[in-house]
Amino acid sequence: VPPGEDSKDVAAPHRQPLTSSERIDKQIRYILDGISALRKETCNKSNMCESSKEALAENNLNLPKMAEKDGCFQSGFNEETCLVKIITGLLEFEVYLEYLQNRFESSEEQARAVQMSTKVLIQFLQKKAKNLDAITTPDPTTNASLLTKLQAQNQWLQDMTTHLILRSFKEFLQSSLRALRQM
């Protein structure tokens, strides 16, 4: 159930509507719940979650990561720079979320929910950002060839890639929400 549509919300018509920040917070937590469910299936299906061979698969990936220069940590915190990084990072993750779509058996709907909820989150955040010009959108052609390359990997690498995407996306969202809670 997407945020704002659970029975508690229906049963409390007199509650104040969520602010934009509260809505973003709730949306990220909803996505984190989805990632947890997907990670459960991944970890149950293979031993990737305990593997020490992550570096082999990471060579093929360029997953977004928070760095000091992005302005999202306490030292050098910069609201606008950080917001641009969060939105840019989420846009870059979209191709990897597309890759995840055919990677799950029992959690297929959950994978779709994570993907769609991320699109909604990006829209929420774009409304919050003042400097939309600074946000670079990934090139569709580059994304298409990356997707083809990832899908052409052997089974072991595909499993490892799935694990790494979920782990990195979770960490990126956690760092993003930590920073957003300071704004």
Epitope: L32, M66, Q74, Q174, S175, L177, R178, R181, Q182
Partner: nanobody, 124 residues
């Protein structure tokens, strides 16, 4: 939810040091964001510091920055608060808190598990 137990509080003179510990039961400690809050007599509970799961993202309240250091040991399921250059205004009950989403932040509502607290008294 996890169980949290604070220890290390006590009476110390101004300028002195104390190290608080927060021991957490449960195998999922390493996925939690952890925080320290404090409540002085007659005041509301306030944020002190918090730390993410792998210690690379730490925030401090302005009032303790440069004096207090938060850290964690995921192998031992323990979080610490090293308090140096203590002042009388640091006197409070110190609580540790855990956020199962691994996010944390400066508000009480972001945390879903709390310890009972440990008393810190700084005399002048």
């Amino acid at each position: 939810q996890v169980q949290l137990v604070e220890s290390g509080g006590g009476l110390v003179q101004a300028g002195g040091s104390l190290r608080l510990s927060c021991t957490v039961s449960g195998r999922t400690f390493s996925t939690y964001a952890m925080g320290w809050f404090r409540q002085a007599p007659g005041k509301e509970r306030e944020f002190v510091a918090d730390i993410n799961w792998n210690s690379d993202n730490i925030w401090y309240a302005d009032s303790v920055k440069g004096r207090f250091t938060i850290s964690r040991d995921n192998a031992k399921n323990v979080m610490y608060l090293q308090m140096n250059s203590l002042k009388p205004e640091d006197t409070a009950v110190y609580y540790c808190a855990a956020d199962s989403y691994g996010v944390g932040g400066g508000k009480e509502e972001y945390y879903d598990s709390w310890g009972q607290g440990t008393q810190v008294t700084v005399s002048s």
